[in-house]
């Protein structure tokens, strides 16, 4: 299920990682498009162990994963994606 995620007027990620995270460890993913006070797109992965990782949007693995999730968005997603809408 795609949902809108709102956040405060600033960036959430101080730094980010390109390290691959297997889907079985991922609880949900937040996509924060550029805007709302942040001059860059951010992707935040919430892991099942309750840790949070900011992922480099240019990392190939997250791009591939997001593409798969987008293609499956008509059905129930194994990994919920939360996307903040920019007005």
């Amino acid at each position: 299920v795609l949902e809108v995620y709102y956040t405060s007027l600033r960036c959430r990620c101080v730094q980010e990682s390109s390290v691959f995270i297997p889907r079985r460890f991922i609880d949900r993913i937040q996509i924060l498009p550029r805007g709302n006070g942040c001059p860059r797109k951010e992707i935040i992965v919430w892991k099942k162990n309750k840790s949070i990782v900011c992922v480099d949007p240019q990392a190939e693995w997250i791009q591939r994963m997001m593409e798969v999730l987008r293609k499956r968005s008509s059905s129930t997603l194994p990994v919920p994606v939360f996307k903040r809408k920019i007005p």
Epitope: P33, R34, R40, I86
Partner: antibody, heavy 119, light 107 residues
Framework: EVQLLESGGGLVQPGGSLRLSCAAS????????MSWVRQAPGKGLEWVSA????????YYADSVKGRFTISRDNSKNTLYLQMNSLRAEDTAVYYC????????????WGQGTLVTVSS | DTQMTQSPSTLSASVGDRVTITCRAS??????LAWYQQKPGKAPKLLIY???SLASGVPSRFSGSGSGTEFTLTISSLQPDDFATYYC?????????FGGGTKLEIK
């Protein structure tokens, strides 16, 4: 090929107004963040303003906030900068830029248009 | 606002030299830094973003490094076409800010 063509610059008196335009082509304009960057004669670069693809998000440098308004017409592939209450320190070449996807980095630049504020 | 300071403001070098330009941020900006090249009377051109990622079409003799508050732009072997003014820019937060520029001139 990405092309950005600014127009509307010229000589204006202090306190006056001017509207700059930037005609864009060669890319999907409505999906792109756009910005204005200026450069005073013999000086460095100064970021002025930015606008999201839909036009719903806008940002300004403190030096122009309340005086300048950035806008866009996606049906015309055109970016605008309405400049009011102009001051001598606004004299500069104004560049229209297209940002890289997802980050506030000017990947493409127009040739610039000169704005001179003088009495 | 995040202040960006470049050094030196002017740099004299010869063709074939290896040159380094430094950019310092007044606060940590991780790797949210871009470098631009500008020639007289022309618009700037993007060289590097995310501190070290080369923009499309930029020669491999240009490289960037650094993280946090200190960044460098290196040209491994100066070519005649490289004599220009170079600017850094942070995009860690708004307002976006540029360094004052480094003019690279022929010795």
């Amino acid at each position: 090929e990405v092309q950005l063509l600014e127009s509307g610059g010229g000589l204006v008196q202090p306190g006056g107004s001017l509207r700059l335009s930037c005609a864009a082509s060669g890319f999907t304009f409505g999906n792109s963040w756009m910005s204005w960057v200026r450069q005073a004669p013999g000086k460095g670069l100064e970021w002025v303003s930015a606008i999201s693809g839909s036009g719903g998000s806008t940002y300004y440098a403190d030096s122009v906030k309340g005086r300048f308004t950035i806008s866009r017409d996606n049906s015309k592939n055109t970016l605008y900068l309405q400049m009011n209450s102009l001051r001598a320190e606004d004299t500069a070449v104004y560049y229209c830029t297209r940002d890289l996807p997802g980050i506030a980095v000017a990947g493409y630049w127009g040739q610039g248009t000169l704005v001179t504020v003088s009495s | 606002d995040t202040q960006m300071t470049q050094s030196p403001s002017t740099l004299s070098a010869s063709v074939g030299d290896r040159v380094t330009i430094t950019c310092r941020a007044s606060e940590g900006i991780y790797h949210w830094l871009a470098w631009y090249q500008q020639k007289p009377g022309k618009a700037p051109k993007l060289l590097i973003y995310k501190a070290s990622s080369l923009a499309s079409g930029v020669p491999s003799r240009f490289s960037g490094s650094g993280s946090g508050t200190e960044f460098t732009l290196t040209i491994s072997s100066l070519q005649p076409d490289d004599f220009a003014t170079y600017y850094c820019q942070q995009y860690s937060n708004y307002p976006l800010t540029f360094g004052g520029g480094t003019k690279l001139e022929i010795k």
